[in-house]
Interface confidence: medium
């Protein structure tokens, strides 16, 4: 009984349940391979509970191990388009602070038009995650085809 | 010490750990693109702890943010079989109540025989999730090739 | 307040937050299709909190439902290489104890060079997970291309 009451009185944030699910806003200007993300109930089913967006990139607010997941679908794409424009590659990594820069997850499209993956990784408060799409094909902005998210798992 | 005891006395359901992992039962009749799922220890490694099945479709019992994941493998499939010009597509969405109908996750097979993805999404008590497979290729019912599940992540 | 203090005093392990993320160490000798994994902060971003490695295979230390995820990328691979060497298949399963041996997750590469998937499955203390890669192509050891992990979700 006591436990249940205490749990209700504590803000969720103190339990470390940081989570975010983002939808694609736009791609970067020339020479900038980054995807720019957006999130919030007004936009549909995207949200940020803990992490924040910094100029379209996701910034972590709580140290811990996170499940990072992503799906990106190329727009106006067929298996022949995808192979003709190969290599189209997506990489998710920590892009700042520079001292912690590292690629966390990388996939190539080859003859497919969608990539989807997920992984567990330690992230620290202040880490900014960037998603780089290299190649000439553009991503779909449909919210059920392209999305990016993180979920805090444990300290 | 007190916390540990209290935690043991509380039913898991009160912690919001709703989770389900389903295996394919069958595909739908004519003009019904839905996959019909089944779950339970007697069937193997599938289970439902919280969510329920309603005529083969997964119904949510607790509001919250969920991780939804799916893998579907086409049976009797090779890269040439997986149609080039008419991709077979899988979509996961809320199909009822009608007022909340939306596509959550969508993938095409292109020249592959398996799709797998996952995403975070808010779901509400009573939401029913449908998985629509469009095309003429049939899915494998092998439990390690085709499965669908949800995991409650936070309120 | 009391809850927060009690929670801080309890070791994380008692909350059941077992988690591991591994990177590829090496492939097996001839006739052994298993991938051999490694993990630990000294190696980069891989880690084991609860589960252990037994000769490169992941052994579970806590009963419960786990999210198992994997990504494997083939080295020196293009869509033509992948299709020429088809079938290249990855299977994740319980390989010991023998009485619980079962395939949990299976994917073929077809014309792609990366597979990635995830699923929820019940695992028991002492279960050892093996990842079998069949075919002639070798996996990439890049830590952002090939990884394998588990996350305890609930009892």
């Amino acid at each position: 009984q006591r436990f249940a009451q205490a749990q209700q009185q504590l803000p969720l944030e103190s339990l470390g349940w940081d989570v975010a699910e983002l939808q694609l806003n736009h791609t970067g200007p020339q020479q900038d391979p980054r995807l720019y993300w957006q999130g919030g109930p007004a936009l549909g089913r995207s949200f940020l509970h803990g992490p924040e967006l910094d100029k379209g990139q996701l910034r972590i607010h709580r140290d811990g191990i996170y499940m990072v997941h992503i799906q990106v679908t190329l727009a106006i794409c067929s298996s022949t388009t995808a192979s003709r424009h190969h290599p189209t590659t997506l990489a998710v990594g920590i892009c700042s602070p520079a001292s912690r820069s590292i690629s966390l997850l990388r996939l190539s499209f080859h003859q497919g038009c969608t990539i989807a993956s997920q992984r567990l990784t330690p992230l620290a408060r202040g880490d900014t995650l960037c998603t780089n799409l290299t190649g000439t094909l553009l991503p779909s902005r449909n919210t059920d085809e392209t999305f990016f998210g993180v979920q805090w798992v444990r300290p | 010490q007190r916390f540990a005891q209290a935690q043991q006395q509380l039913p898991l359901e009160s912690l919001g750990w709703d989770v389900a992992e389903l295996q394919l039962n069958h595909t739908g009749p004519q003009q019904d693109p839905r996959l019909y799922w089944q779950g339970g220890p007697a069937l193997g490694r599938s289970f439902l702890h919280g969510p329920e099945l309603d005529k083969g479709q997964l119904r949510i019992h607790r509001d919250g943010i969920y991780m939804v994941h799916i893998q579907v493998t086409l049976a009797i499939c090779s890269s040439t079989t997986a149609s080039r010009h008419h991709p077979t597509t899988l979509a996961v969405g809320i199909c009822s109540p009608a007022s909340r109908s939306i596509s959550l996750l969508r993938l095409s097979f292109h020249q592959g025989c398996t799709i797998a993805s996952q995403r975070l999404t808010p779901l509400a008590r009573g939401d029913t999730l449908c998985t629509n497979l469009t095309g003429t290729l049939l899915p494998s019912r092998n439990t390690d090739e085709t499965f669908f599940g949800v995991q409650w992540v936070r309120p | 307040q009391r809850f927060a203090q009690a929670q801080q005093q309890l070791p994380l392990e008692s909350l059941g937050w077992d988690v591991a993320e591994l990177q590829l160490n090496h492939t097996g000798p001839q006739q052994d299709p298993r991938l051999y994994w490694q993990g630990g902060p000294a190696l980069g971003r891989s880690f084991l909190h609860g589960p252990e490695l037994d000769k490169g295979q992941l052994r579970i230390h806590r009963d419960g439902i786990y999210m198992v995820h994997i990504q494997v990328t083939l080295a020196i691979c293009s869509s033509t290489t992948a299709s020429r060497h088809h079938p290249t298949t990855l299977a994740v399963g319980i390989c010991s104890p023998a009485s619980r041996s079962i395939s949990l997750l299976r994917l073929s590469f077809h014309q792609g060079c990366t597979i990635a998937s995830q699923r929820l499955t019940p695992l028991a203390r002492g279960d050892t997970l093996c990842t079998n890669l069949t075919g002639t192509l070798l996996p990439s050891r890049n830590t952002d291309e090939t990884f394998f992990g588990v996350q305890w979700v609930r009892p």
Epitope: - | T27, Q31, H85, H86, G135, P139 | -
Partner: antibody, heavy 118, light 109 residues
């Protein structure tokens, strides 16, 4: 090599039920992914799809025949069967069983002629 | 339900190219399969998914599909090619999953 063989009476009286069996060798009727199908061809005419069964029980039928058709499977004998009730002379045809994968019917039986006549 | 329209007959001299068409509303959005049926025999799948050939089918058989017409092309026609040819579509979203065309009789002159 997969082979299909139709069997059953070649003559059926009007208003009775036509019953045919297809025996499969070189493959299993319980394998995922296959549409085990019946197709017919009236003398001198084109092909008409009757229906199919898959996943050891799920069936789909041609709407024009649906009220009279039943397709079933017997996995123990590796067979699937067709029953067509209330037959008339218009049901006289060569009846084929076939295996499809959603990209065409790649294996066919040799066909059996069923005549509806009193 | 969906209707596939084929010409009743097509004639071609040996060594020439035969083109057999199959018409249907927006057929280009569907997968089309072609069968060859010789007298007294069961049909044989010669082209599937618009343009793919099963193993054992000569390269002389090819297919295309766009708009409202799918076409089976047989180059360097031989006497042994004489047969009935049927197109077929398979669409689980319609009330009739499997639809065959009426068939085209190919005569080799």
């Amino acid at each position: 090599q997969v082979q299909l063989q139709e069997s059953g009476p070649g003559l059926v009286k009007p208003s009775e039920t036509l019953s045919l069996t297809c025996t499969v060798s070189g493959g299993s009727v319980s394998t995922d992914g296959y549409y085990w199908s019946w197709i017919r061809q009236p003398p001198g005419k084109g092909l008409e799809w009757i229906g199919y069964i898959y996943y050891s029980g799920s069936t789909n039928y041609n709407p024009s025949l649906k009220s009279r058709v039943t397709i079933s499977v017997d996995t123990s004998k590796n067979q699937f069967s067709l029953k067509l009730s209330s037959v008339t002379a218009a049901d006289t045809a060569v009846y084929y069983c076939a295996r499809g994968i959603g990209l065409g019917f790649e294996y066919w039986g040799q066909g059996t002629l069923v005549t509806v006549s009193s | 339900s969906y209707v596939l329209t084929q010409l009743t007959s097509v004639s071609v001299a040996p060594g020439q190219t035969a083109r057999i068409t199959c018409g249907g509303n927006n057929i280009g959005s569907k997968s089309v399969h072609w069968y060859q049926q010789k007298p007294g025999q069961a049909p044989v799948l010669v082209v599937y998914d618009d343009s793919d050939r099963p193993s054992g089918i000569p390269e002389r058989f090819s297919g295309s599909n766009s708009g409202n017409t799918a076409t089976l092309t047989i180059s360097r026609v031989e006497a042994g090619d004489e047969a009935d040819f049927y197109c077929q579509v398979w669409d689980r979203s319609s009330d009739q999953d499997v639809v065959f065309g009426g068939g085209t009789k190919l005569t080799v002159l």
